[in-house]
C-alpha cells in the first residue's frame, strides 16, 4: 500500500531532522509517468544511502520496511516494462530534503494515478 | 512568480453548468506540479473539489464526483472546471491553486472569483 | 464530517505566544500544511512539511506534528495575525486533499 510508504517517508524525515547528512542522492524530479517504475526503483536505491550514512538503527529498520512495502507495490502492478528511461546515474544529485520531497511527489504520482 | 487568474460568469441558473478557467502565467502547466480546485461557500471553510495533472490524470472530491470535469489545456497554459446540475448549495468564491512538489500543500493560488447560483 | 478537526476559534494577547492545533488520523501518515486567510483575500501558504515557511512569511509563523495532531504555532503575534487558519492535508486513501474547518484567531 502506497500510503504507508508514505508514512514511513514521513518516519524518515522525522528521524533525520536531528542528524547532519552531507549526501547527495540521484534525485528525478520531473516523473514521465511511463516512467515512474524506473525512477522509483532509482529511489529506492539512493533510500540505502541515507540508511548507510546515517548509521541509525531506527532509519535502518524505517528504510527496510519501506523498500519492502514498495517493492510488494510495485510487483501487484504487474512486470511492468518501460524503456527509453533514465538511468539513475544520469539523474540530478540533490540533497536528502530535496531528495525526500521528489520521493513524496513520485509516491504521490503512484496513489493518484492508481 | 507564478500567478494564475480565474474567469467565468458570475451567475448560474439552478440546474446549469458552472464553468470556470484558470489562466496559469509565469509558469507552465506542463510542470512536476499538479493543478487543483478549491471553493468557499460565504462565511464557510475551504472544500476542495479536484485535482489535475498536465498528462490528464485528475482525481476529484469524492462528494462532488459526479457532478465534476477538470481538464487541462496545454497550448493555452490553463485548466477548467465544469460543474454540473448547481443549486444554490454551489454558490461560493471558487479559487484555482498550484499544490507544492511533495507533501501536501497549495503553494500559489488565484485571487478567486464569486460564483452565484440563482435564477 | 471533516477527517481533520479544528478548534473554531482561538485567541491571543498582542505579542504572546498561541498554537492551532489540527487533529486526523490521516496526520500519522501525511505532515499538514496551514494557510493564513483575511476576509476578502484568498489563502495564503504560511507552513508545508515538517516546518517548512514559503519566503516571505515570517519567523514567528512555525509547524508541528505529533502522532495525529499538526499545530501551528504563532511566537509573539501581531495585529495583522488576525485571521483564518485552516489545516490541509490527504485523506487516508492518499487520494483526495481535505481542509480543517479552520480556526478564527483573534488577537486582543
Known amino acids: 500500500n502506497w500510503v504507508n510508504v508514505i508514512s514511513d517517508l514521513k518516519k524518515i524525515e522525522d528521524l533525520i531532522q536531528s542528524m547532519h547528512i552531507d549526501a547527495t542522492l540521484y534525485t528525478e524530479s520531473d516523473v514521465h509517468p511511463s516512467c515512474k517504475v524506473t525512477a522509483m526503483k532509482c529511489f529506492l536505491l539512493e533510500l540505502q544511502v541515507i540508511s548507510l550514512e546515517s548509521g541509525d538503527a531506527s532509519i535502518h529498520d524505517t528504510v527496510e520496511n519501506l523498500i519492502i512495502l514498495a517493492n510488494n507495490s510495485l510487483s501487484s502492478n504487474g512486470n511492468v516494462t518501460e524503456s527509453g528511461c533514465k538511468e539513475c546515474e544520469e539523474l540530478e544529485e540533490k540533497n536528502i530534503k530535496e531528495f525526500l520531497q521528489s520521493f513524496v511527489h513520485i509516491v504521490q504520482m503512484f496513489i493518484n494515478t492508481s | 512568480q507564478v500567478q494564475l487568474q480565474e474567469s467565468g460568469p458570475g451567475l448560474v441558473k439552478p440546474s446549469g453548468t458552472l464553468s470556470l478557467t484558470c489562466a496559469v502565467s509565469?509558469?507552465?502547466?506542463?510542470?512536476?506540479?499538479?493543478w487543483s480546485w478549491v471553493r468557499q461557500p460565504p462565511g464557510k471553510g475551504l472544500e476542495w473539489i479536484g485535482e489535475?495533472?498536465?498528462?490528464?490524470?485528475?482525481n476529484y472530491n469524492p462528494s462532488l464526483k459526479s457532478r465534476v470535469t477538470i481538464s487541462v489545456d496545454k497550448s493555452k497554459n490553463q485548466f477548467s472546471l465544469k460543474l454540473i446540475s448547481v443549486t444554490a448549495a454551489d454558490t461560493a468564491v471558487y479559487y484555482c491553486?498550484?499544490?507544492?512538489?511533495?507533501?501536501?500543500?497549495?503553494?500559489?493560488w488565484g485571487q478567486g472569483t464569486l460564483v452565484t447560483v440563482s435564477s | 464530517s471533516s477527517e481533520l478537526t479544528q478548534d473554531p476559534a482561538a485567541s491571543v494577547a498582542l505579542g504572546q505566544t498561541v498554537r492551532i492545533t489540527c487533529q486526523g488520523d490521516?496526520?500519522?501518515?501525511?505532515?499538514a500544511s496551514w494557510y493564513q486567510q483575511k476576509p476578502g483575500q484568498a489563502p495564503i501558504l504560511v507552513i508545508y512539511?515538517?516546518?517548512n515557511r514559503p519566503s516571505g512569511i515570517p519567523d514567528r509563523f512555525s509547524g508541528s506534528s505529533s502522532g495525529n495532531t499538526a499545530s501551528l504555532t504563532i511566537t509573539g503575534a501581531q495585529a495583522e495575525d488576525e485571521a483564518d487558519y485552516y489545516c490541509?492535508?490527504?485523506?487516508?486513501?492518499?487520494?483526495?486533499?481535505?481542509f480543517g474547518g479552520g480556526t478564527k484567531l483573534t488577537v486582543l
Open positions: 491553486a498550484r499544490e507544492g512538489i511533495g507533501w501536501p500543500s497549495f503553494d500559489y
Open positions: 509565469g509558469g507552465s502547466i506542463s510542470s512536476s506540479n499538479w
Open positions: 512539511g515538517k516546518n
Open positions: 489535475i495533472y498536465h498528462y490528464g490524470y485528475t
Open positions: 490541509n492535508s490527504r485523506d487516508f486513501s492518499g487520494k483526495n486533499l481535505v
Open positions: 490521516t496526520l500519522r501518515n501525511y505532515y
